[in-house]
């Protein structure tokens, strides 16, 4: 988990001839605000919803009135950063759209009017935790200067925010291959539970046993660079998964949508469908009228002149939702059978089949066990002529449909403390014990009969890759 941060430095006329007229005038003072939309992957088609990584709206900037006869200067900007929280791993590559909007504050009927001044878009590679990246984009005669970065929210660390930091009980000792967590030097990286050998630079996992590649890398361990041409293929981060897929908490757990919004999971995060009068990533923005310009993607706002009366967005073709915020989802017809994942690539629908199924719509059953549905990433195990589900971490019951506390089984031995994280279980060992489950007492050499390590000796920590 983490936050993408965007800092707008300036918005104004670009260099060269043909400077644009100021968007504001003495008769029509105005102010600016910005909207950012993030999508995973290098390709436009990689996003399976308009802003799959998230979107954010800035505050309004100061009111600006053009001075007669003066050239259009850089326009006054809103304070603060635009922040787009992401729940899962940072994908490493992303596409962005930054829109500059003008809010006119004249005496026109119906209150302020909104209009889109400029839209810039781009595709970038970015590692989480790195320094601010500076950028300049031009849209027509306008120029936008900005910086951006992705940072992880504790306890996550790493270039994809998939590593976990946790306190250690003695200085300078972490586990096999585990470095101190810069800048938290008093903490250690806790183990990733990725597939063994998964590249720490180019791979990541959101579930134990998998190895998902950042854009530009491929192979089962994400060690093979993809050629430039295939980097732009219509794919998001690839998945080379083996073993037991273990989902962490669902993105809709606890319903992140405020004000009666309903939550639906997307391939990388979640999406809120907001009731009338509310919008925003989590339906947190309220008291909306047409003056607030709540209709995205070119939707036409009708009614709602005051906060007590509802507005209606008339959406252009291809968009839907109370704020035209959602691309029409052809996957809602559920064309993929047997639990296949539907991908709307724009030009075509594609089904990504579960293990054991094949065919354009996953209609072909490849193995006997696949007829037995194990929910939530559970795997079907054949044994003794019967089938049963081996449930993923955090799930239980006959078909793995029941939520279970992964720490309830008390996996940590010898007083180790259990933490359930989206990347798997982590045991923090008591002094004198080592192993991923703290199952081994530490014996200094030549004293193997001792039950524990002497004071100050830090036990080993779990391996980095499980």
């Amino acid at each position: 988990a983490g936050v993408f941060e965007l800092q707008i430095h300036s918005f104004g006329p670009g260099p060269g001839p043909g400077a644009p007229r100021s968007p504001c005038s003495a008769r029509l003072p105005c102010r600016l605000f910005f909207r950012v939309c993030l999508k995973p992957g290098l390709s436009e088609e990689a996003a399976e919803s308009p802003c799959a990584l998230g979107a954010a709206l800035s505050a309004r900037g100061p009111v600006y009135t053009e001075q007669p006869g003066a050239p259009a200067p850089d326009l006054p900007l809103p304070d603060g950063l635009l922040q787009v929280p992401f729940r899962d791993a940072w994908p490493g590559t992303f596409s962005f759209i930054i829109e500059t909007w003008r809010e006119e504050l004249g005496d026109q009927i119906g209150g302020p009017a909104w209009s889109l001044l400029a839209r810039v878009a781009g595709r970038r590679r970015l590692a989480a935790g790195g320094p601010w990246a500076r950028d300049i984009q031009r849209a027509g005669a306008w120029e936008l200067r900005f910086s951006y970065r992705a940072r992880c929210e504790p306890p996550a660390v790493g270039t994809a925010c998939t590593r976990l930091c946790r306190p250690r009980s003695a200085p300078s000792r972490c586990g096999p291959g585990l470095r101190p967590c810069a800048p938290l030097e008093d903490e250690c990286e806790a183990p990733l539970v990725c597939r063994a050998g998964c590249s720490p630079e180019h791979g990541f996992c959101e579930q134990p046993g998998e190895c998902r590649c950042l854009e530009g890398w491929t192979g089962p361990l994400c060690t093979v660079p993809v050629s430039t041409s295939s980097c732009l293929s219509p794919r998001g981060p690839s998945s080379a998964t083996t073993g037991c897929l273990v989902p962490g908490p669902g993105p809709c757990d606890g319903n992140p949508c405020a004000n009666g919004g309903s939550c639906s999971e997307t391939p990388r995060s979640f999406e809120c469908t907001c009731p009338r009068g509310f919008y925003g990533l989590r339906c947190e923005v309220s008291g909306v009228t047409c003056a607030d310009g709540p209709c995205f993607n070119g939707g036409l706002c009708v009614g709602g002149a005051d906060p007590d009366s509802a507005y209606i967005c008339h959406c252009p073709p291809g968009f839907q939702g109370s704020n035209c915020e959602k691309r029409v989802d052809r996957c809602s017809l559920q064309p993929c059978r047997n639990g296949g994942l539907c991908l709307d690539l724009g030009h075509a629908l594609r089904c990504r089949c579960r293990a054991g199924f094949a065919g354009p719509r996953c209609e072909h059953d490849l193995d006997d066990c696949a007829g037995r549905a194990c929910a939530n990433g559970g795997t079907c195990v054949e044994g003794g002529g019967a089938h049963r589900c081996s449930c993923a971490l955090g799930f239980g019951g006959r078909d793995c449909r029941e939520r279970a506390d992964p720490c309830a089984a008390r996996p940590c031995a010898h007083g180790g403390r259990c933490y359930a994280h989206f990347s798997g279980l982590v045991c923090a060992c008591a002094p004198g014990y080592m192993g991923a489950r703290c199952e081994f007492p530490v014996h200094p050499d030549g004293a193997s009969a001792l039950p524990a390590a002497p004071p100050g000796l830090r036990p080993g920590d779990p391996q980095r890759y499980l």
Partner: antibody, heavy 122, light 106 residues
Framework: EVRLVQSGAEVKKPGASVKVSCKAS????????MNWVRQAPGQSLEWMGI????????SYNQKFRGRVTLTVDKSASTAYMELSSLRSEDTAVYYC???????????????WGQGTTVTVSS | DIQMTQSPSSLSASVGDRVTITCKAS?????VSWYQQKPGKAPKLLIY???NRYTGVPSRFSGSGSGTDFTLTISSLQPEDFATYYC?????????FGQGTKLEIK
């Protein structure tokens, strides 16, 4: 390819010590614990101990009462097992075995060395 | 220490037979792993976490059980399956193995 290659057979006299090496390749040596397991002729497997190659921390089977010492040379990606005060019942094949964890933190030995035969005879 | 008891100690079977080997722990071990060993060779991992087949292990091998009672099943014996099989527990220190089950050709 992940491989563990052990040193050759040894013949020792009672009371002596033996040091067996295990060179790892194909993976990052410090990312996985290393175990030593022995097998006397016609017998089952017997766990001797485990070492954290990153820190050097060790845990031993109490049965060996301080006779076993596990060490590593990180720069050479090599683990060592030294057994002292040898007696005839220490005659066995000694294996190094990499320790791996599954998603529920279930440990298992996923890669084994080819084994080193140690014969203790007067 | 936790005792792991395998049964039977030895077993004669034919190619194509279905074979079941059991492993009983003296106390709860949560899960076991199963290993195959051929004469003069190192053991090879077959099953971990009681029921997870290791990479490259044929689907005719399956494991089941939890707590103290575990089973390894070979659904249809192949000539290369004749070997000695060991269960092992890594749940509790010290790690221990069963005494082995020798699978011979009938």
């Amino acid at each position: 390819e992940v491989r563990l290659v052990q040193s050759g057979a040894e013949v020792k006299k009672p009371g002596a010590s033996v040091k067996v090496s295990c060179k790892a390749s194909g993976y990052t040596f410090t990312d996985y614990y290393m175990n030593w397991v022995r097998q006397a002729p016609g017998q089952s497997l017997e766990w001797m101990g485990i070492i954290n190659p990153y820190t050097g921390d060790t845990s031993y089977n109490q049965k060996f009462r301080g006779r076993v010492t596990l060490t590593v040379d990180k720069s050479a990606s090599t683990a060592y097992m030294e057994l002292s005060s040898l007696r005839s019942e220490d005659t066995a094949v000694y294996y190094c075995a990499r320790y791996h964890y599954g998603p529920h933190l279930e440990g298992y030995f996923d890669v084994w060395g080819q084994g080193t035969t140690v014969t203790v005879s007067s | 220490d936790i005792q792991m008891t395998q049964s039977p100690s030895s077993l004669s079977a034919s190619v194509g037979d279905r074979v079941t080997i059991t492993c009983k722990a003296s106390e709860n071990v949560g899960y076991v792993s199963w290993y195959q060993q051929k004469p003069g060779k190192a053991p090879k991992l077959l099953i971990y976490g009681a029921s997870n087949r290791y990479t490259g292990v044929p689907s005719r091998f399956s494991g089941s059980g939890s707590g103290t009672d575990f089973t390894l099943t070979i659904s249809s014996l192949q000539p290369e399956d004749f070997a000695t099989y060991y269960c092992g527990q890594s749940y509790s220190y010290p790690l221990t193995f069963g005494q082995g089950t020798k699978l011979e050709i009938k």
